[in-house]
């Protein structure tokens, strides 16, 4: 058993039939000795009494907010909350598994740029009872601090019969050099707790490798004279890290006709400009990826030809 | 240390071709030691982030952009030199400050050179003839040395008298491949800069 | 394995016109990016222009824009580099060169895997 915040505890269990579970001794947290009372969630049933409360933990049902009491005066509270262990491993209900970039990820973070600031989100299922809380550091040995703030529902969604709940959270670190070589990776801790189960779920990156530019900016086309050809310009996006001649980005130009069968035409080019032959219906995309660090493409900026 | 002493060819230094040149050669033999060392902890999640130029160069610092230098964070770890001016000229006028940057790669250079090629050694007595050290990726780090055009003593290749540990040496050259590949990517952001500067 | 030979180099007066061409052996050429570099006496091959695979996007480097038009005709695995109001540095050997799309920027010499011999263009005043 351990504590996770103030009056709060997890007891981890191997979970199997008939397994024998785990003893916990509770303290009332109170000077007095005498006439104290346990009880368990709203129920009034008195499950003992005196100054300590010992129970075999084995389920659910064993878990939850065991309450002192004298004389009808409630004097702590202890929250016990459940870490299930299966065949060794640590049970993963609470968030889905999104398979990308490989099976069992269940947090995804991606960077804007070299600054320091990242965003991680995660997906469930479950709508109520639930809660999240993030931390983050640099290295784990002698960890150098990143700030989180609190997780926050920022999408819902339809798939099949469920819906999907995704929640995200940004984090900054403290003291962030954009050009600095990163040797120790940023790890991020999510504990989640659903009703009375609580999980914990890691990631572990460079933010080298999480690095997902915004798309680039200012996707505009220019006819040129006496030509079917128009010149198409961007620019690069705000959030890139400076200077653009340090921190470069090389692009990905693509002409889509109208028909999404019809083969696209793409080049890669180091330039924020191209000359392209511009036809009724198509469109113009442009994305963006590090020029020296290949990390994620942005999505594409697109304009239609007409 | 001595810092090498800058010898300027007239004309325009060819640093950057050289720089975009070396890292997509470390970056392909990179790809190839994983490939080829599937069975091997050689992805970056797997190795031990080293960087044998700790301590003795100061690459980050001494090529630091102008505009980082007002960022304390980039400041903080050591006595710190910034490009305040200049392009990848070797013009007779380069700055103080960015022939100590390109000297500064020089040295990283030439500190990966010496490992690679005692590496090497050791790779060509394996029985297995697994892996060995792509010769163009060698080259290349050559022609960056050479365009960078600076005079300093020659290190001696290390040799080692024990047996070499196969299986060590591999599990090295894929933690050397990573550092040179990350120190590769700061080589050619800084190239890009002082051409565009 | 690809071959591809220039032609329509030749000597010009300033502010004349040429039109080179580079046919393409071997292979398809329609999933290659096409380019036209060009290399003076002394100095380092520079790029000149690009087109994609199917022609539908192009650069230029900044002193030929508005003078030079790159166009290729798949059918005939060809690529055309129309130059026109030439000047004294247009002189030099230019060479065309195909390369896989994904191979990295189109205007970049080591995007490119296979060369021509290269054509002569000289111009004088």
């Known amino acids: 058993i351990w504590e996770l915040k103030k009056d709060v505890y997890v007891v981890e269990l191997d979970w199997y039939p008939d397994a024998p579970g785990e003893m916990v001794v509770l303290t009332c947290d109170t000077p007095e000795e005498d006439g104290i009372t346990w009880t368990l969630d709203q129920s009034s049933e008195v499950l003992g009494s005196g100054k300590t409360l010992t129970i075999q933990v084995k389920e659910f049902g064993d878990a939850g907010q065991y309450t002192c009491h004298k004389g009808g005066e409630v004097l702590s509270h202890s929250l016990l909350l459940l870490h299930k262990k299966e065949d060794g491993i640590w049970s993963t209900d609470i968030l889905k598994d999104q398979k990308e970039p490989k099976n069992k990820t269940f947090l995804r973070c991606e960077a804007k740029n070299y600054s320091g600031r990242f965003t991680c989100w995660w997906l469930t299922t479950i709508s109520t009872d639930l809660t999240f809380s993030v931390k983050s550091s640099r290295g784990s040995s002698d960890p150098q601090g990143v700030t989180c703030g609190a997780a926050t529902l920022s999408a819902e969604r339809v798939r099949g019969d469920n819906k999907e709940y995704e929640y995200s959270v940004e984090c900054q670190e403290d003291s962030a050099c954009p050009a600095a070589e990163e040797s120790l990776p940023i790890e991020v801790m999510v504990d989640a707790v659903h009703k009375l189960k609580y999980e914990n779920y890691t990631s572990s990156f460079f933010i080298r490798d999480i690095i997902k530019p915004d798309p680039p900016k200012n996707l505009q086309l220019k006819p040129l004279k006496n030509s079917r050809q128009v010149e198409v310009s961007w620019e690069y996006p705000d959030t890139w890290s400076t200077p653009h001649s340090y921190f470069s980005l090389t692009f990905c130009v693509q002409v889509q006709g109208k028909s999404k069968r019809e083969k696209k035409d793409r080049v890669f080019t180091d330039k924020t400009s191209a000359t392209v032959i511009c036809r009724k219906n198509a469109s113009i995309s442009v994305r963006a990826q590090d020029r020296y660090y290949s990390s994620s493409w942005s999505e594409w900026a697109s304009v239609p030809c007409s | 240390r001595n810092l090498p002493v800058a010898t300027p060819d007239p004309g325009m230094f060819p640093c950057l071709h050289h720089s975009q040149n070396l890292l997509r050669a470390v970056s392909n033999m990179l790809q190839k030691a994983r490939q080829t060392l599937e069975f091997y902890p050689c992805t970056s999640e797997e190795i031990d982030h080293e960087d044998i130029t700790k301590d003795k160069t100061s690459t980050v610092e001494a090529c630091l952009p102008l505009e980082l230098t007002k960022n304390e964070s980039c400041l903080n770890s050591r006595e710190t030199s910034f490009i305040t001016n200049g392009s990848c000229l070797a013009s007779r006028k380069t700055s103080f400050m960015m022939a100590l940057c390109l000297s500064s790669i020089y040295e990283d250079l030439k500190m990966y050179q010496v490992e690679f090629k005692t590496m090497n050694a050791k790779l060509l007595m394996d029985p297995k003839r697994q892996i060995f050290l792509d010769q163009n990726m060698l080259a290349v780090i050559d022609e960056l040395m050479q365009a960078l055009n600076f005079n300093s003593e020659t290190v001696p290749q290390k040799s080692s008298l024990e047996e070499p540990d196969f299986y060590k040496t591999k599990i090295k050259l894929c933690i050397l491949l990573h550092a040179f590949r990350i120190r590769a990517v700061t080589i050619d952001r800084v190239m890009s800069y002082l051409n565009a500067s | 394995q690809v071959q591809l030979v220039e032609s329509g180099g030749g000597s010009v007066q300033v502010g004349g016109s040429l039109r080179l061409s580079c046919v393409g052996s071997?292979?398809?050429?329609?999933?290659?990016?096409m380019g036209w570099f060009r290399q003076a006496p002394g100095k380092e091959r520079e790029f000149v222009a690009a087109?994609?695979?199917?022609?539908?996007?192009?650069d230029y480097r900044d002193s030929v824009k508005g003078r030079f038009t790159i166009s290729r005709d798949n059918a005939r695995n060809t690529m055309y580099l129309q130059m026109n109001s030439l000047k004294p540095e247009d002189t030099a050997v230019y060479h065309c060169?195909?390369?896989?799309?994904?191979?990295?920027?189109?205007?970049?010499?080591?995007?490119?895997?296979?060369w021509g011999q290269g054509t002569q263009v000289t111009v004088s005043s």
């Open positions: 087109i994609s695979g199917k022609g539908l996007i192009s």
């Open positions: 071997g292979r398809t050429l329609n999933m290659y990016n």
């Open positions: 060169a195909a390369g896989q799309w994904s191979a990295g920027p189109f205007t970049r010499e080591r995007s490119y895997e296979y």
